[in-house]
Each structure stands twice: as structure tokens, then as C-alpha cells.
């Protein structure tokens, strides 16, 4: 429905608080280097303008699109060219090209300082002194570091962030109350950002059809009692929401997400029996809860899939009449019966079915041709099952840290050209699949593990896209969204790689390592391990283990020494020499 003033429409729908927060997120996700104060100023100007349009929708400029209004505002930033270089050229373009230009310049790995958490008392003072500024700063800092963060969900995180400070700054032991909550928000936030990044990559790199297929599969698993028509409606609406958020249309996205949550709750009887609790919550919690809701029970007595999709004489007729609808039905019917499969596996099965029909419906005897199509599914199902079984056994044997190290070695040998920080970050995240998923029973392992790995490998893909260095990574990332994980799994050692020259500086450590947290110390050691493999890609597991054990002993010894720095200097030289000898460097 058309509104005279889009900005007034969204301001009224969302309310001033959410409007301001979403505009701040949008601006911070576009101009990631701009100071906080500059963004706040821009947001206030936009908000004042929106209020004039609410008062009179016919007022000057109120009929302009949000992209025009926001783009014009961003292009008033004085230091645009100095700070962002060629992004300033976007401002010479007209909408919609200008917005597309801004989107293309979003940086997944912006050159921003790591967020250092101040002392609890300092944070509580800042919170009490100016709660509004404190919370805006949170939105700004997360949004600029995660330019694809799902904006309405970030509002939910901010609400929890505020609740944590409200509660804990009054507690007897503020730190004991607050720090675990902040750690949880940080970890959940990183996971949420990565999941949303995959949705945006799916839409932007593989198109709406790919996203809709993913959504049909996931929603059919989650709502197996819902009719295909209901799932189709939810998929259409969900696709609109994510297309908007991924396209920077955050006000529309948040508004449409609220409408979708409302619809789901009003129609929960025909969607899922698991929604009752979610639907009693306030809006932000409700939307989050629905997004995370457990799978409903499967309907009783579902018939064999073969009846509709193999044995029926009308398979080719049904396929020819409406290909995507028929494939959607196949995916819906398969997914609702298989909550034990990963979404990507279900999509591989649907792709195999589609390929078979394309071939067989043109054959002399179509039924004879596609009669055995379900047999082709068996190896596709067994491959992830076997891989998860092997890796969970390895994880249980090694524990998380050493399992991460095994993956670091594995992936560095596959794609040694990738930067060390990226290999460390991605392999550490890949390794977390163990503690996240291996504890689950068989029926939940695959959807947990393989869909999580899709999210992590997408991180590798988006980081690599910024600075491409490996044809193998590009190939696995771009050929097929659903086959990314099997593509990376199938990579062997890169025999074309010329080992990196040895640089003693890379393996020089100082006393500052002793004051690092356990996690930071692990990252230092894992960085050294990647560098070691880059120098000696043919090193055996045993050789690498021996060097890493010596390295751990060296760090432990020197951190206990009276003169730590001297110990690191002298023992470090010995360690480097011994390692070179052990590895034949």
C-alpha cells in the first residue's frame, strides 16, 4: 500500500526509539569508519525531519524514498573521500545505483581496533551517567564491525545488554553478575552475525531462488504440520524481510519482521504447536523466539514420498506444468519427514531430483529413467553422516583445542595462500562444531554440524572475496552454495604451493604472552602452528605435534621464570633452532 511519505509511515509504525536505533545501525553499517558523534548527529537530523513529515506528509521532501533521504544524508559527510576513498564516488550516482554502490563497499573485515572491555565500575558509571548514549554506542560499535548484522535482532541484543547493566550495576558483586552475561551476548552476537551473513550471501551471490529453497527446507523441518501453502506464504514473507535487511532497507525490514511475527502468532494453530510460549512475549523477544523455536512433531502417518515423486504416472506432467512449485513440494515433503538431515543435504537431494527429471522427462521412457532416483540419494546422505561420525570421534579423543589444531593443519595444507589470521579464525570456528554438535544424539547431529559448517565456511568465503588469493577457495565458494562444505572437504594438500620462506621473527615471543587470557594464548600458539605449516606443508602430524608440545613447554617455563623476557629471548632461540632441525627447515 502506497504512502504519501515513506519516512513518516515507518516512523509511525516503528516508534521514535526503534526508528532512531535502526537509522543509526543503517548509517554505521554503511559508513563504518565514521566517529560515533558524527553518526548521532546525522541520526538526529533524520529523526527531526521524519517528525516534520509525520506532522505533514505533504511537507517538502517528505515524498522522497528512504534511500534518497538516507543517501543524501550520508553524502553530506565532509571527510567521505579522505576516509573511504572510492566509496565517495557513490555520491555522484542516482538511486538505486547509489545504494547498490554503498552496499558493494560494505567491509566484512573493517580496519577497526578490537573492542576492549573496560573495568566493570567504569562501564556502570558510563551506563548510569548517560544510559541512552551508552546503548547507542553499543549499537554503533556492533553495527560498524558487523555490516550485515540482522538489524531487528540487534535491537533485541541491545535490549538484553541494557537489562544486564540495569540488573548487575546494582548487584553486590557487579563483575560476577555482568561479565558472564556480556560474554554470552558477545558469543551469541558473533554467531548471529555469521548466520545472517550467510543469508545475505545466499541472496546476493546465488539469488532469491536459492534463499527460498533454503527457507522451504528449514521451515518445513520446523513446521512439519503446516500445509505447503502456509510454508510457501511464510517463505515469501521471510524472503522479503531478509532481502530488505541485506539490502540496507532496515526500517522496512524491521516493520515487515514485526508483521510476520504477528501473522505467525495469529495463525499458530495451522503452523506449529510449539509457538505458544513465543507468542506471549513482547515483540523483540517474540521474533527472536520464533526464529529459534524447536521443530514441531511430524504429522502421523505421512505416506511414502515415492508415491508422489517416483511411482506416480504424472511426475513429468506435474514437473512440466510448474517446475519450481513441484520441486518446492518435493523439498517440503522431504524436509518435513527429515528433521535429522541438514538443510544443505536436503537441497542437494532436491538438486539431484531436479537434474534427474530434467534428463528423464526428455527420455523415451521417463518412468523407467527416473524409477531409481531415490537410490542416488543414498551416497549423498552417507557422506555427511560418515564425516560427522569421524570428526566427532576425533573431537572426543582430542578435546576442542587440539581438534582445532588438527583442523588448522588440515585447512592450511588445503589452502595455504589464505592469510594466517583468516585461517586461525575460520579453523577455530570450524573446531567449535565439536562442542556444539557432537553432544547431540544421532538424529540432531547432522543438522547441527553441517548447517553450522555452512555458516563458518561462508565467513571464509566473504573474507577471501575481499582479497582473493586462492583459486581453490574461489572455486569452492562460487560454484555451488550447497556443495561448499563437500568441496572444501574434498580438497587435498595443495601440491602447487611454494613453501613460505622461514622468518625467525614470526616465531619470536615475548613476556606479554604470559598476561594474555587462555583464549588469546591459544590464538598465539595456533598462529605459530599455521605459520609452521606454511613453511613446511609436508610436515607430518607427529613432527608438528612434537614442535607444538615443545612450544607449549617453552611458554609455560618462561612464564614461570623470574626474568621472563630473558627466558623468552634465550630459550626462544633454542626452540627455533630445535624446531628447524626437527622439521628439516
Amino acid at each position: 500500500d502506497a504512502h504519501k511519505s515513506e519516512v513518516a509511515h515507518r516512523f509511525k509504525d516503528l516508534g521514535e526509539e526503534n526508528f532512531k536505533a535502526l537509522v543509526l545501525i543503517a548509517f554505521a553499517q554503511y559508513l563504518q569508519q565514521c566517529p560515533f558523534e558524527d553518526h548521532v548527529k546525522l541520526v538526529n537530523e533524520v529523526t527531526e525531519f521524519a517528525k516534520t513529515c509525520v506532522a505533514d506528509e505533504s511537507a517538502e521532501n517528505c515524498d522522497k524514498s528512504l534511500h534518497t533521504l538516507f543517501g543524501d544524508k550520508l553524502c553530506t559527510v565532509a571527510t567521505l573521500r579522505e576516509t573511504y576513498g572510492e566509496m565517495a564516488d557513490c555520491c555522484a550516482k542516482q538511486e538505486p545505483e547509489r545504494n547498490e554502490c554503498f552496499l558493494q563497499h560494505k567491509d566484512d573485515n573493517p580496519n577497526l581496533p578490537r573492542l576492549v572491555r573496560p573495568e566493570v565500575d567504569v562501564m556502570c558509571t558510563a551506563f548510569h551517567d548517560n544510559e541512552e548514549t551508552f546503548l547507542k554506542k553499543y549499537l554503533y560499535e556492533i553495527a560498524r564491525r558487523h555490516p550485515y548484522f540482522y538489524a531487528p535482532e540487534l535491537l533485541f541484543f541491545a535490549k538484553r545488554y541494557k537489562a544486564a547493566f540495569t540488573e548487575c550495576c546494582q548487584a553486590a558483586d557487579k563483575a560476577a553478575c555482568l561479565l558472564p552475561k556480556l560474554d554470552e551476548l558477545r558469543d551469541e552476537g558473533k554467531a548471529s552475525s555469521a548466520k545472517q551473513r550467510l543469508k545475505c550471501a545466499s541472496l546476493q551471490k546465488f539469488g532469491e531462488r536459492a534463499f527460498k529453497a533454503w527457507a522451504v527446507a528449514r521451515l518445513s523441518q520446523r513446521f512439519p504440520k503446516a500445509e505447503f501453502a502456509e510454508v510457501s506464504k511464510l517463505v515469501t514473507d521471510l524472503t522479503k524481510v531478509h532481502t530488505e535487511c541485506c539490502h540496507g532497507d532496515l526500517l522496512e525490514c524491521a516493520d515487515d519482521r514485526a508483521d510476520l511475527a504477528k501473522y505467525i502468532c495469529e495463525n499458530q494453530d495451522s503452523i506449529s504447536s510449539k509457538l505458544k510460549e513465543c507468542c506471549e512475549k513482547p515483540l523483540l523477544e517474540k521474533s527472536h523466539c520464533i526464529a529459534e523455536v524447536e521443530n514441531d512433531e511430524m504429522p502421523a502417518d505421512l505416506p511414502s514420498l515415492a508415491a508422489d515423486f517416483v511411482e506416480s504416472k504424472d511426475v513429468c506432467k506435474n514437473y512440466a506444468e510448474a517446475k519450481d512449485v513441484f520441486l518446492g513440494m518435493f523439498l517440503y515433503e522431504y524436509a518435513r519427514r527429515h528433521p535429522d538431515y541438514s538443510v544443505v543435504l536436503l537441497l542437494r537431494l532436491a538438486k539431484t531430483y531436479e537434474t534427474t527429471l530434467e534428463k528423464c522427462c526428455a527420455a523415451a521412457d521417463p518412468h523407467e529413467c527416473y524409477a531409481k532416483v531415490f537410490d542416488e540419494f543414498k551416497p549423498l546422505v552417507e557422506e555427511p553422516q560418515n564425516l560427522i561420525k569421524q570428526n566427532c570421534e576425533l573431537f572426543e579423543q582430542l578435546g576442542e583445542y587440539k581438534f582445532q589444531n588438527a583442523l588448522l593443519v588440515r585447512y592450511t595444507k588445503k589452502v595455504p595462500q589464505v592469510s594466517t589470521p583468516t585461517l586461525v579464525e575460520v579453523s577455530r570456528n570450524l573446531g567449535k562444531v565439536g562442542s556444539k554438535c557432537c553432544k547431540h544424539p544421532e538424529a540432531k547431529r547432522m543438522p547441527c554440524a553441517e548447517d553450522y559448517l555452512s555458516v563458518v565456511l561462508n565467513q571464509l568465503c566473504v573474507l577471501h572475496e575481499k582479497t582473493p588469493v586462492s583459486d581453490r577457495v574461489t572455486k569452492c565458494c562460487t560454484e555451488s552454495l550447497v556443495n561448499r562444505r563437500p568441496c572444501f572437504s574434498a580438497l587435498e594438500v595443495d601440491e602447487t604451493y611454494v613453501p613460505k620462506e622461514f622468518n625467525a621473527e614470526t616465531f619470536t615471543f615475548h613476556a606479554d604472552i604470559c598476561t594474555l587470557s587462555e583464549k588469546e594464548r591459544q590464538i598465539k600458539k595456533q598462529t605459530a602452528l599455521v605459520e609452521l605449516v606454511k613453511h613446511k606443508p609436508k610436515a607430518t602430524k607427529e613432527q608438528l605435534k612434537a614442535v607444538m608440545d615443545d612450544f607449549a613447554a617453552f611458554v609455560e617455563k618462561c612464564c614461570k621464570a623470574d626474568d621472563k623476557e630473558t627466558c623468552f629471548a634465550e630459550e626462544g632461540k633454542k626452540l627455533v633452532a630445535a624446531s628447524q632441525a626437527a622439521l628439516g627447515l
Partner: nanobody, 118 residues
Framework: EVQLQESGGGLVEPGGSLRLSCVAS????????MSWVRQAPGKGLEWVSS????????SYADSVKGRFTMSRDNAKNTLYLQLNSLKSEDTAMYYC???????????LGQGTLVTVSS
Amino acid sequence: EVQLQESGGGLVEPGGSLRLSCVASGFTFQHYAMSWVRQAPGKGLEWVSSISLVGGGTSYADSVKGRFTMSRDNAKNTLYLQLNSLKSEDTAMYYCVRGWHPDVPRPLGQGTLVTVSS
């Protein structure tokens, strides 16, 4: 507006046959599994059978298994129920409804009455 128009009922002797039809309108017929339910005089609704979206997969209540056959024609937006070897206990008002094994009340058409009596 969703409309389901049942027809084909009537008076039949035990052992006889009938074919019920249900014409659907106001929604995308092929996007829904469909079911037949019935209500005997003075009794509650009883599920009879369901059919999948495409029509290949069916499910039947034990009381009608082997005697009733459900089918659909998506091109005609029509649902069918072939009733064979009818018994007096099959006497009921028959309704077609949207959904597989509908366990929540759904909008019913006016139904079609089947009376099995000698």
C-alpha cells in the same frame, strides 16, 4: 473466500457403492493436502482419509481401509472419495477439509449425506 462444495451422497443399500466429489475454490488447491471427515448422527467428527499434495500418497482410517479410495484432480480442483462395500456404520454427513489428518477444527462445507440402509 475458501469454499468446499461436497456432492454425490445419497441412500444406498449395504454392500453398495457411491462416489463423493468436492470442488474447491478460493485457494490454491494443489498447495494443500486434503482430507475427508464424517459425522454420524449424534456423534463427533471422525477422520476418514487424507491425500498428499500431488495425490500419490494416501492414508485411511482403519474402519474404511480397503473399502474407500481417495483421489484428486488438481487440474479440476476436485477431490474424490470412492466408497465401496458400504456398511450401515458408514452412515454420516461427509465433509472435505483442507489439511493432512486435520486435528484442529477447520471450516467445513455444507457436506453431503450418505445413508446406508436396507
